[in-house]
């Protein structure tokens, strides 16, 4: 008789794929004309990325550092009207993209939480949560919570409102902190909170250090659902050496939890790479005309259009990974086991019951390395085969689908491999 299938865990929509942050509507759409009506026209692009949620805004009225002139219920007319927002929600729903609204109050000001009037701001947030939940949003994000006095109790209250409306709604909190103890204390009072932080960016970017960061985080947070990013708002290129960009995309998509990206991460967009751009919100490079000020400043391989036509581009890798992440059980909710491999490498397995299993091998080093996989660390339920099929490599030159002998596996500098192998009873 075949062994009984393991019962599937309860899956919320944010467990099923990546979240995509658009913190600046105008920079995302380019040409200084970004609004909600225009964003509706970009939903097909987001669908092509297979992201599950769009983290949008803030969009509300906020006169820099002025509580009285900050209204979390009113959309800033520069972004459009409430009707435009409702239309965007409807269109996103049709494409199965959830919309999460950033309600960080003083987003144009110095202290994002108006340090002197925390209580009245917290009341405004409470009202806004209810208002926008009834409007149909799927969740909220608040950032810089380390600057919010009594953050844990406010977050608990806001999570109660959000979950009280529906268990299917999500609250995301962001912090600049990279301190694991601080992160854990914020998570402890909120069972379903998704927390983005700078935890992973406080790294020496070696295989060993990354492995220890990931395992410490997972151990400290127990069996709760995690999110993975390098910051609460910034671009990957602002935190990573360029040569590790592909490696990190592979890692973020295959760790157990929700990967969270910022617009432009999929094409390697750089903050302030082009003259005159604001550092925090570079213009999204849709095509070569996205930066008309300086002719020739943008080459095709920097743009969405150019990378869409190139199967070896970062964007193509992102789409492939996002696709795998959203459909493979082992990557959706599989168990996670790291094991020993050569110095400079970080290797792990994702597996779920009798489904196809995945092996991830990441070479953070500047030199080619033998994988040196040592399966002795693995539990019996997750043993390694002698061969596994290549799903993808972060570097060109390998044939997808080809079987690779694990004992002889060698990786190029900064190469990451995603391999698959079947469950054997």
């Amino acid at each position: 008789r075949a062994p009984r299938c393991r019962e599937l865990p309860a899956q919320k929509w944010w467990h099923t794929g990546a979240l995509y942050r658009i913190g600046d509507l105008q920079a995302f759409q380019g040409h200084g004309s970004g609004n909600l009506a225009g964003l509706k026209g970009r939903l097909d692009y987001l669908s092509s990325l297979k992201v599950k949620g769009l983290v949008l805004g803030p969009l509300h009225k906020n006169q820099k550092d002025d509580v009285a002139q900050t209204d979390l219920l009113q959309i800033d007319p520069n972004f459009g009207s409430k009707e435009d927002f409702d239309n965007l929600l409807q269109s996103a729903k049709k494409k199965s993209i959830r919309v999460i609204l950033d309600l960080t109050p003083n987003y144009r000001g110095e202290n994002l939480w108006f340090s002197t009037q925390v209580d009245s701001v917290a009341t405004k947030v409470k009202d806004a949560l209810e208002f926008w939940l009834q409007a149909g949003v799927d969740g909220f994000q608040v950032r810089d919570i380390e600057n919010l006095k009594d953050a844990s109790s406010f977050l608990a209250e806001w999570e109660n409102i959000t979950k009280g409306f529906s268990e299917d709604r999500l609250l995301i909190a962001g912090t600049n902190s990279s301190d694991l103890q601080q992160i854990v204390s914020l998570l402890e009072s909120n069972k379903d909170l998704l927390l983005t932080s700078s935890y992973l960016s406080d790294s020496s970017f070696t295989g060993e250090h990354t492995k220890s960061l990931v395992t410490q985080y997972l151990n400290a947070t127990g069996n709760r659902w995690c999110s993975w990013s390098l910051s609460q708002a910034g671009l990957l290129t602002s935190f990573l050496p360029a040569q590790l960009l592909r490696l990190y995309q592979l890692m973020l998509f295959t760790l157990p939890g929700t990967p969270v990206f910022s617009y432009g991460d999929e094409i390697g967009l750089k903050a302030a790479a082009l003259p005159g751009q604001p550092v925090e919100a570079p213009v999204m490079l849709w095509d070569e005309s996205s930066f008309p000020d300086i002719p020739g400043a943008v080459s095709a391989n920097m743009t969405v259009k150019g990378q869409s036509e190139d199967p070896g581009s970062l964007l193509s890798l992102f789409r492939q990974l996002s696709d795998q992440r959203s459909k493979e059980r082992s990557l959706l909710h599989g168990d996670f086991h790291t094991f020993s491999s050569g110095p400079g490498l970080f290797s792990y397995i994702r597996h779920w019951d009798q489904n196809e299993r995945f092996l991830v091998v990441l070479n953070f080093g500047d030199v080619g390395l033998s994988a040196g996989l040592q399966a002795s660390d693995l539990p019996a339920s997750a043993s390694l085969p002698t061969k596994a099929d290549l799903v993808l490599s972060t570097q060109p030159g390998r044939e997808e689908g080809s079987p690779l002998e694990l004992e002889r596996l060698k990786l190029e500098p900064h190469e990451g491999l995603l391999l698959r192998f079947p469950y054997v009873a």
């Epitope: 219920l73 009245s120 405004k124 009202d127 209810e130 208002f131 009834q134």
Partner: nanobody, 125 residues
């Protein structure tokens, strides 16, 4: 059970002002989101304004912003609608409503559990 009674309606000339009041029964008034809606002859009921439990947050129909102001006095269990620069198209029956589930009432009338009988506002040109 919450009972709501509107008052303050009447006949006014275009450009004039009116202040509507809505008195609520019950000791938990400060825990309701409150809203005003209106219904013109032959038309559907439409949203006017809403105010949160504490009165901290307000929200208005786009077309009325700047002319109408919603406020509340929790000590008196009353919510108000100050209407300035009235126009003939503001002629309607004005209803007040209580949302007992949410502190922040909403723009759709489905969320409101309790309604008043309405007060007639007529603006002549």
């Amino acid at each position: 059970q919450v009972q709501l009674v509107e008052s303050g309606g009447g006949l006014v000339q275009a450009g004039g002002s009116l202040r509507l009041s809505c008195a609520a029964s019950g000791r938990t008034f400060s825990r309701y989101g409150m809203g005003w809606f209106r219904q013109a002859p032959g038309k559907e009921r439409e949203f006017v304004a809403t105010i949160s439990c504490s009165g901290t947050s307000t929200y208005y129909a786009d077309s009325l912003k700047g002319r109408f102001t919603i406020s509340r006095d929790n000590a008196k269990n009353t919510v108000y609608l100050q209407m300035n620069s009235l126009k003939p198209e503001d002629t309607a029956v004005y209803f007040c409503a209580a949302d007992t589930r949410h502190c922040m009432g909403y723009t759709k009338d489905g969320g409101y559990a309790y309604w008043g009988q309405g007060t007639q506002v007529t603006v002549s040109s």
